[in-house]
Interface confidence: low
């Protein structure tokens, strides 16, 4: 029977700069029941606080709700693991909420084959930003990426869409069924997960762009 091994805070993420969650990996438990607590203070303050919510983010997590989230200060946090034989502490982690934003995936992905009479046919892809993100005030610049592939293909074709919420693709294989997904990232943060795939059947008479 031993004191617990050193835990590690390995990830902090915010969906929108208004709340955030951090997760830690426990060290070895020393063969005994082990309690974990996350404590933090804000840069420039000496007062230590304990994690306000160990539930919302799931096991080994700390969730900071709106009233605990500040874009204006760096958080300095550590996890303490304690059992009957003693304690161990994680390294301190410095967290700036602005840099840990990982938005939800874009919404309402719509895909359509367009075949104008006078021009080459194309695939038209349209989506909406995630609902939690406030784009109107300039708080966020969201960038988008699209990926698509024929259903049975191994490789994805990736297109960067910038800030647009719609995109045209010309070069596609006629008669194939395609999967299409989109994801987004803020200027200072992380890519979201890919949106659920939308399927589209490309007509056999779709002319590939030359």
């Amino acid at each position: 029977q031993l004191p617990p091994g050193k835990p590690e805070i390995f990830k902090c993420r915010s969906p929108n700069k208004e709340t955030f969650t951090c997760w830690w990996r426990p060290g070895t438990d020393g063969g005994l029941p082990t309690n974990y607590s996350l404590t933090y203070h804000r840069e420039g303050e000496t007062l230590m606080h304990e994690c306000p919510d160990y539930i919302t983010g799931g096991p080994n997590s700390c969730h900071f709700g709106k009233q605990y989230t500040s874009m204006w200060r760096t958080y300095i946090m550590m996890v303490n693991a304690t059992n009957q034989m003693g304690s161990s502490f994680s390294d301190e982690l410095y967290v700036d909420v602005t840099y840990i934003v990982q938005p939800d995936p874009p919404l309402e992905l719509a895909v359509e084959v367009k075949q104008p009479e006078d021009r080459k046919p194309y695939l038209w892809i349209k989506w909406s930003p995630p609902t939690l993100i406030d784009l109107k005030t300039g708080w966020f610049t969201l960038l988008y990426e699209i990926r698509l592939k024929p259903e049975k293909a191994a490789e994805w074709e990736i297109h960067f869409a910038g800030q647009q919420t719609e995109f045209k693709i010309l070069s596609l294989h006629p008669g194939q069924k395609y999967l299409v997904q989109v994801r987004c990232k803020p200027d200072h943060g992380y890519w979201s997960a890919w949106s659920p795939a939308t399927f589209i059947q490309i007509p056999s008479d779709f002319t590939m762009n030359d």
Epitope: S70, W72, T98, G138, G162, D187, H188
Partner: antibody, heavy 118, light 111 residues
Amino acid sequence: QVQLQQPGSELVRPGASVKLSCKASGYTFTSYWMHWVKQRPGQGLEWIGNIYPGSGSTNYDEKFKSKATLTVDTSSSTAYMQLSSLTSEDSAVYYCTRGNYRYYFDYWGQGTTLTVSS
Amino acid sequence: DIVLTQSPASLAVSLGQRATISCRASESVDKSGFSFMNWFQQKPGQPPKLLIYAASNRGSGVPARFSGSGSGTDFSLNIHPMEEDDTAMYFCQQSKEVPWTFGGGTKLEIK
């Protein structure tokens, strides 16, 4: 260190257009909003608009929408503001200022004094 | 647009005394529990200089005699003790939403 360099002055005829420049250095130009602010002699400060060099996205105050056009040249880390159909009301000092990601103006150019006169 | 009203328009304060400048917003500039109100100092022939951001946080290199307070719609900038170098124009500015707006300014002088 962060610097925003603006020409000291411009003299332009009424009815003409002018393109004011703001050359940025000492930071990643494409990662911060660039704002433009107008100050008439002895008056307060007016926000004209901003541009995000990483994407070209812009916002304008409604009253400057038909007057000002904001652009950037990322290869030279330079922001531009074109002012059109100039009148004496446009005579002012124009500042470029960097928008910190926490939404305040942290660095300012020295300002360009624009004089509209025949 | 959010309108910011500063008072007084001008103020004369003795050296060593306290100067208080107020700024009232036409609607709340709070979001997510934080106040998007900033204060700037401007001296003749110079660009504005950031003093306070987010209502109460001092900008880089700003002396401790400058302090900001307030939330919602009512904010104030305090300077204490007043020094000769503090003679300048002071502006409040909100960055809660586009268009960013400034107060009309307060001229602070030595009495």
